[in-house]
């Protein structure tokens, strides 16, 4: 026996003293364990384990299935083993047909032999098909045949253990290799919507789709900055061998304002992790917020076009939109459309197209929008800039010359005197009286200005020019004077447009 210190416990001794033993089928297996502190025999083969508390293990009629490792253990936990092969010509292999291999790892085809003295113990493809060229294996009569570094391409490979017994090739039952793929990338995660906007009491439901090579990918919904376990439901599918999809649906049946926040769908595998978030905003009631895209006070030249544009946020969806002018609703000339085609879009655009505006079309243009919860509106004050128009130019009985002009912005009237027949009226004449006639009238439209000068100031024949102008343009009217004795006469007044 190996040298052992006197006080030191030693392993039990087994008789017969062999590491491996062959017993013929039908014969007795008798194994003796000698140890002062004998505890038990154990037998193991494949996934089967048996125990025996007698120091002599006896199997009266050995069967192939009694092939395996017999271990005797003493009270110190020390053990000795013997491996017994029960040689049965009718059953050369013991088989456990479940065969799973992890990609890039070794896997064991469990077909231990009942006779270790057979030759050519190896693997063969089913129905005479060859094994993959790169498949390497290592046989072990006691355990089976180890396939080295399993490849994904071996999935569903059909094979047999094979050995030559008395010159004849014997095949085991068939094995189908199922390859569990290795994770070589992080899971792919996506979410049904990136953001949700709900009213209190509505159901919040969001689906996360997790895609990976196998179902052993881990996934969960988490609420950011919270440890609370969320209620999820799962659906999953295998689309082919290495294409697994899981849908994890998170539901809050009646959302509250304090449920608002960021929810993360997290997935991980042995390679790494991935996540995607969705934002939930719960409001106590719906809303509409309108944002004008141009100034709400609009100045536009007579005859030109203008577009009144608003963007607005509406939740829930807008139900009614209208543009109104002077209590009249536009039926055309406007369009309303969502800002984006995104499912979670709440932003919309409305445009009113005003073409070739007349001076009479200034005023308040109102956009109204409503949904099931609220109404909202915005007003645009549109001012049409018009070139002054001289409405009247008269010589009054009191000797005053009066010029009345209308336009927007408010026209300015200047007076000029041209002596004789000179066309250039350069000498300015100060008016005696200037009045804005409709300042208290309606807020939009033309402003009317009246200006008067005293004609007694003129001592010679000549022309008096009344010039009305604003930012848009100018218009002039002329008074021709001729003296007949002491009397002044207005000959023909006429207007002259100066662009």
């Amino acid at each position: 026996q190996p040298s052992v210190s006197p006080g030191e416990p030693s392993p039990p001794s087994i008789h017969p003293a062999k590491s491996e033993l062959i017993v013929r089928v039908g014969n007795e297996i008798r194994l003796l364990c000698i140890d002062p502190g004998f505890v038990k025999w154990t037998f193991e083969i494949l996934d089967e384990t048996n125990e025996n508390k007698q120091n002599e293990w006896i199997t009266e009629k050995a069967e192939a299935t009694n092939t395996g490792k017999y271990t005797c253990t003493n009270k110190h936990g020390l053990s000795s083993s013997i491996y017994v092969f029960v040689r049965d010509p009718a059953k050369l292999f013991l088989v456990d047909r479940s065969l799973y291999g992890k990609e890039d790892n070794d896997t064991l085809v469990r077909c231990p032999l009942t006779d270790p003295e057979v030759t050519s113990y190896s693997l063969k493809g089913c129905q005479g098909k060859p094994l993959p060229k790169d498949l390497r294996f290592v046989p072990d009569p006691k355990a089976g045949i180890t396939i080295k570094s399993v490849k994904r391409a071996y999935h569903r490979l059909c094979l047999h253990c094979s050995a030559d017994q008395e010159g004849k090739s014997v095949l085991s039952d068939k094995f189908i290799l199922k390859v569990r793929p290795a994770f070589k990338a992080v899971p792919v995660v996506s979410v049904s919507k990136a953001s949700y906007l709900l009213r209190e009491g509505e159901e919040f439901t969001v689906t996360c789709t997790i895609k990976d090579v196998s179902s052993s990918v881990y996934s969960t919904w988490k609420r950011e900055n919270s440890q609370t376990k969320l209620q999820e439901k799962y659906n999953s599918w295998h689309h082919g061998d290495f294409n697994y999809e899981r849908q994890a649906t998170l539901t809050i049946s009646s959302a509250r304002v304090n449920d608002s926040g960021v929810f993360m769908c997290y997935a991980n595998n042995t390679f790494g992790s991935a996540n995607v978030t969705t934002t939930l905003e719960v409001v106590d009631k719906g809303f509409i917020n309108i944002f004008p895209m141009i100034n709400t006070t609009v100045f536009v030249n007579d005859g030109e076009n203008v577009d009144l544009i608003v963007e607005y946020e509406a939740f829930p969806k807008p139900e009614h939109q209208q543009w109104i002018y002077m209590n009249r609703t536009f039926t055309d000339k406007w369009e309303d459309y969502p800002k984006s085609e995104n499912e979670s879009n709440i932003r919309y655009v409305s445009e009113l197209h005003l073409t070739r505006l007349k001076g009479t079309e200034g005023g308040t243009y109102t956009f109204l929008v409503s949904n099931s919860d609220v109404n909202a509106s915005i007003a645009f004050n549109v001012y049409v800039n018009t070139k002054p128009e001289i409405l009247t130019y008269d010589r009054l009985v009191n000797g005053m010359l009066q010029c009345v002009a209308a336009g927007f912005p408010e026209p300015t009237i200047d007076w000029y005197f041209c002596p004789g027949t000179e066309q250039r009226c350069s000498a300015s004449v100060l008016p005696v009286d200037v009045q804005t006639l409709n300042a208290s009238g309606p807020p939009f439209g033309k402003l009317v200005v009246q200006s008067s000068i005293d004609s007694s100031a003129f001592k010679h024949n000549g022309t008096v020019e009344c010039k009305a102008y604003n930012d848009v343009g100018k218009t002039s009217a002329y008074f021709n004077f001729a003296f007949k004795g002491n009397n002044k006469e207005q000959i023909h007044p006429h207007t002259l447009f100066t662009p």
Epitope: Q1, H15, P16, A17, K18, V23, N27, L32
Partner: antibody, heavy 121, light 107 residues
């Protein structure tokens, strides 16, 4: 050729020592447990002792008649088995056979021709 | 130690005879029994192992039977080359004891 050849026998005085050797050829020596068996002139076979292989941790076992005096050892690198015999007695006179065990049973499936050890004053 | 008792210690037989040699163990040794043949001046030769398994190269006229404590070696038709001494040996527990031998002689 598969064979075992013993050597080292001869005449030795009682109380003295002798070392027998057995050289193996034609098979993988290290796979096998090995034994010594002796046969006194005109008598039956007597098992002397054995040594296990590496799988059996080179454990040795001896017959009671030689325990403490004889030592069995092996050198797998030299395909050799040894029997060191100390404190020899006249009753140790015998032909000493080296015998191989097969891998999976305890029997002696291959024997050497034997070497004669004579212990006499 | 396990004692092995062989009988008869010798027997005379003619060529063609059926010869039976028995071996008894002092305790059960299951099938851990081997039979050897030895001719004068030669090393023993293994005939039967595990009580009944014929060693490769051994003629089929040799057979073994028995289990537990009682074992038999049978030569179905004795041939001239079979005249020799036969030994049984137990291989259950060390020391691996041999029987005293049975000498088969020509009648």
């Amino acid at each position: 050729e598969v064979q075992l050849v013993e050597s080292g026998g001869g005449l030795v005085q009682p109380g003295r020592s002798l070392r027998l050797s057995c050289t193996a050829s034609g098979f993988t020596f290290s796979d096998h447990d090995m034994n010594w068996v002796r046969q006194a002139p005109g008598k039956g076979l007597e098992w002397v002792g054995r040594t296990r292989n590496a799988a059996g941790s080179y454990t040795t076992e001896y017959a009671a008649s030689v325990k403490g005096r004889f030592t069995i050892s092996r050198d797998d690198s030299k395909n050799s088995l040894y029997l060191q015999m100390n404190s020899l007695k006249t009753e140790d006179t015998a032909v000493y056979y080296c015998a191989r065990e097969p891998k999976y049973w305890i029997d002696f499936d291959l024997w050497g021709r034997g070497t004669l050890v004579t212990v006499s004053s | 130690d396990i004692q092995m008792t062989q009988s008869p210690s010798s027997l005379s037989a003619s060529v063609g005879d059926r010869v039976t040699i028995t071996c008894r163990a002092s305790q059960s040794i299951s099938s851990y029994l081997n039979w050897y043949q030895q001719k004068p001046g030669k090393a023993p030769k293994l005939l039967i192992y595990a009580a009944s398994s014929l060693q490769s190269g051994v003629p089929s006229r040799f057979s073994g039977s028995g289990s537990g404590t009682d074992f038999t070696l049978t030569i179905s038709s004795l041939q001239p080359e079979d005249f020799a001494t036969y030994y049984c040996q137990q291989s259950y527990i060390a020391p691996y004891t041999f029987g005293g031998g049975t000498k088969v002689e020509i009648k």
